[in-house]
Interface confidence: medium
């Protein structure tokens, strides 16, 4: 089910099947910035709460997904969905939760022995004819199943910033996406005029640290919109 | 429209083969599942797998482990499913739903196909 | 496996009547629950998915609730034509269920 991404997440360069298939309608939706109560094609939102609107994964919680909402598929819109759990369907590694990844349109456990001894007994998962490697994921990006057990440390290839050790995320690098350092006060930051346009990026940055925001730096207020710098700030 | 339509009543014999073909049209073949369900004449619906014509992926029900095999042809929008080492229980209506990929609702069905197996 | 039970297994009434049936998931589903409509001779019919929302195309008189392992599925008012088995399905993980279906006629 998972499309070739070309060593990235994004959504965007992913083809038909999310625009044919889209997220899961039944799956909570990010809790951040509020709560949203899917409910097939029409969304009830809780205290006016809006779902949070992505274009890749990285800009959803470690728990989420960048995926459309709506049954059927407007690829259009996309929020942050609630990871999925084990032997659940999915189409790439981002959307299954924490300790699990996508194998054969399927979120197992990182631990394999688990994974035998539970998902088996009740289903055989069998790769596919002709478009399958041999890791079973088709065209997809293939990675050490290593860093599904070992948090990455900077540099390592990761899919997504859980897979990268703690102040670290997952960013994109050239054609593929590393783990890099969380930003500190007073560091350069990008701030995006509009959601996903860093998805054209090659050298990600990180997004701040903790308590930190990507504000203009003060004494750039006068410059002109194009070479305003931006920087992690205390809020 | 969004049609599935499956191909026609087969009658086998024991410890044969069968292969029931599922022709989509009216929606873009790759971008759902499709699932494969059977009914005994007077019983329910018993699941038996899923594959995405996409990637050829499948994942079939424990019951039916080592007997069925879900293929696909893509140019042709055709799904397939053949159930081996045929026994008299195994006669039923077989129908191809399609679902989306997460949401395992079965909005279109085929009319079904009847395997009778007899010897 | 999650199994799915549901309840009555058949049942009888009139036409206007209000109609209710139960299906109980083995294990905490969610929301992750279908319901179809079977006509003698027919493929089935998704008539509610995610436990409550109605499929397009199909009449208000039918209408689902419930969340974890506790589902109802209600026809308002019956209709003739409402005469059918209908079938609960969880998808809350796989293998998928289905339940074993409650046979509805018209007294």
């Known amino acids: 089910t998972l499309n070739s991404v070309l060593n990235s997440n994004a959504i965007k360069n992913l083809p038909p099947p999310l625009g044919g298939a889209a997220g899961h309608p039944g799956s909570a939706v990010s809790a951040a910035p509020g709560i949203l109560y899917p409910g097939g094609n029409k969304y009830q939102t809780i205290d006016n709460y809006q779902p949070y609107p992505c274009a890749e994964d990285e800009e959803c919680g470690t728990d989420e997904y960048c995926a459309s909402p709506t049954r059927g598929g407007d690829a259009g819109v996309q929020i942050c969905l609630a990871c999925r759990k084990r032997r659940k369907r999915c189409m790439r590694h981002a959307m299954c939760c924490p300790g699990n990844y996508c194998k054969n349109g399927i979120c197992v456990s990182s631990d394999q022995n688990h994974f035998r001894g539970e998902i088996e007994e009740t289903i055989t998962e069998s790769f596919g004819n002709d478009h399958s490697t041999l890791d079973g994921y088709s065209r997809r990006t293939t990675l050490s199943s290593k860093m599904y057990h070992t948090k990455g440390q900077e540099g390592s290839v990761c899919l997504r910033s859980s897979d990268c050790a703690s102040g670290l995320c997952c960013a994109r690098h050239f054609w593929s996406k590393i783990c890099k350092p969380v930003l500190k006060e007073g560091q350069v930051c990008t701030k995006h005029r509009r959601k996903g346009s860093h998805g054209l990026e090659i050298f990600q940055r990180c997004y701040c640290g903790e308590g930190l925001s990507c504000r203009i730096q003060k004494d750039h207020h006068q410059a002109s919109n194009s070479s305003r710098l931006h920087t992690c700030q205390r809020h | 429209q969004v049609q599935l339509v499956q191909s026609g009543a087969e009658v086998k014999k024991p410890g044969a083969s069968v292969k029931v073909s599922c022709k989509a049209s009216g929606y873009t073949f790759t971008s759902y599942d499709i699932n494969w369900v059977r009914q005994a004449t007077g019983q329910g619906l018993e699941w038996m797998g899923w594959m995405d014509p996409n990637s050829g992926n499948t994942g079939y029900a424990q019951k039916f482990q080592g007997r069925v095999t879900m293929t696909r042809n893509t140019s042709i929008s055709t799904a397939f499913m053949e159930l081996s080492s045929l026994r008299s229980e195994d006669t039923a209506v077989y129908y191809c739903a399609r679902t989306d990929y997460f949401y395992f609702g079965m909005d279109v069905w085929g009319q079904g196909t009847t395997v009778t197996v007899s010897s | 496996d999650i199994q799915m039970t549901q309840s009555p297994s058949s049942l009888s009434a009139s036409v206007g009547d209000r109609v209710t049936i139960t299906c109980q998931a083995s294990?905490?589903?969610?929301?992750?629950l279908n319901w179809y409509q079977q006509k003698p001779g027919k493929a089935p019919r998704l008539l509610i998915y995610?436990?409550?929302n109605l499929e397009t195309g199909v009449p208000s008189r039918f209408s689902g609730s419930g969340s974890g392992t506790d589902f109802t599925f209600t026809i308002s008012s019956l209709q003739p034509e409402d005469i059918a088995t209908f079938y609960c399905q969880q998808y809350d993980h796989l293998p998928i269920a289905f339940g074993q279906g409650t046979r509805l006629e018209i007294k």
């Open positions: 294990q905490d589903i969610s929301k992750d």
């Open positions: 995610d436990a409550s």
